[in-house]
Amino acid sequence: QSGPLPKPSLQALPSSLVPLEKPVTLRCQGPPGVDLYRLEKLSSSRYQDQAVLFIPAMKRSLAGRYRCSYQNGSLWSLPSDQLELVATGVFAKPSLSAQPGPAVSSGGDVTLQCQTRYGFDQFALYKEGDPAPYKNPERWYRASFPIITVTAAHSGTYRCYSFSSRDPYLWSAPSDPLELVVTGTSVTPSRLPTEPPSPVAEFSEATAELTVSFTNEVFTTETSRSITASPKESDSPAGPARQYYTKGN
């Protein structure tokens, strides 16, 4: 075969947003018959020639960026897309409110505001049932997420997180849920006016993986402004389908 082997996929099950002390599994999926997998934690010198990482209880030191690749014969694949494993519940939850209120007419405007008592410069808003992450900068303890020309598609349950760009994989606990109610009829579904979602891969049970445990290792995290989606819901236990709207510098 000429050229590099196609990249595998790397997913976090059940989610890439993991509360401290809760379980998560990282799985690397390549084609059948792979000779060797390599799963590595970026910004550390740690890697394992295995393709699955079972974590019984999430730790701060495990948060960060991961990627994997595989080898067939003497050929190495391209690396997977990076997976960003986030530890949540590291800080107290922010509060989430809607201005002018959580009930809004279709076609109207609403602003969701996430506020924290800490000096965080990053905020993430997600809507249950939607698939991907967004970003947008803000500082000074609060972030506003305007939703222009609201449609029925914006109805749902929202939560937000706060965190620091200096430790981008250590997040607060989620805010209490805010239920946004849209009254009237909707013409077309719309999204927040921010960047488009990242593509999300699905987990297939035919994955070739091995077991490995990083749980006794101590890792460092590297500052990054990129927060990716957690895995999309699929037939195998996978991540929650949620949409993220992230504000940061």
């Epitope: 099950l13 993986e209 236990p237 929650p240």
Partner: antibody
Amino acid sequence: VQLQQSGAELVRPGTSVKVSCKASGYAFTYYLIEWVKQRPGQGLEWIGVINPGSGVTNYNEKFKGKATLTADKSSSTAYMQLSSLTSDDSAVYFCARSIYYGTIDYWGQGTTLTVSS
Amino acid sequence: DIQMTQTTSSLSASLGDRVTISCRASQDISNYLNWYQQNPDGTVKLLIYYTSRLHSGVPSRFSASGSGTDYSLTISNLEQEDIATYFCQQGSTLPYTFGGGTKLEIK
């Protein structure tokens, strides 16, 4: 995915028994194996979990010293040994596959253990 | 240990009914809540994992929701094959624990 457990056992109090669970239809070392107890007409009790790839185990405190979990990668078989048996150990024991800690996606058919003199 | 409570131990319903089974945890389990079905022959199957995710091959008439400590399983259009005992289980914190079960019967 199939988890085939060994057959029913009738044993004397004070003895030990080893229940087997043969996995097929998937790569044995890619998933965890958990064990669950169910006494007649009662609920389910989690015993423990083993990572077949590494041999790492976690037990319910209640079953430490009672249950020992092992796995043989070459035969894709998990085992649970129960020691110092009493009538309280009479139950159906399930092995099950889990995709991450604490979430079982496939169950064995169960092995009935009867402890009686 | 986290206690899982299914307050209704048995439930009678008619075919075609919408049935809801509830489960309460003694502390926040962060959506690590699974639902299992045990048939009269003793076989156990996963229905729902991580609060609301439908396992492969499970009919869409099954759905579930919840957060924090309160969770529920709903069968929207009860069929004969749904007659079974339903268990909730938390996979949040060791040791993982199950509810006492809710036995579903036909009226």
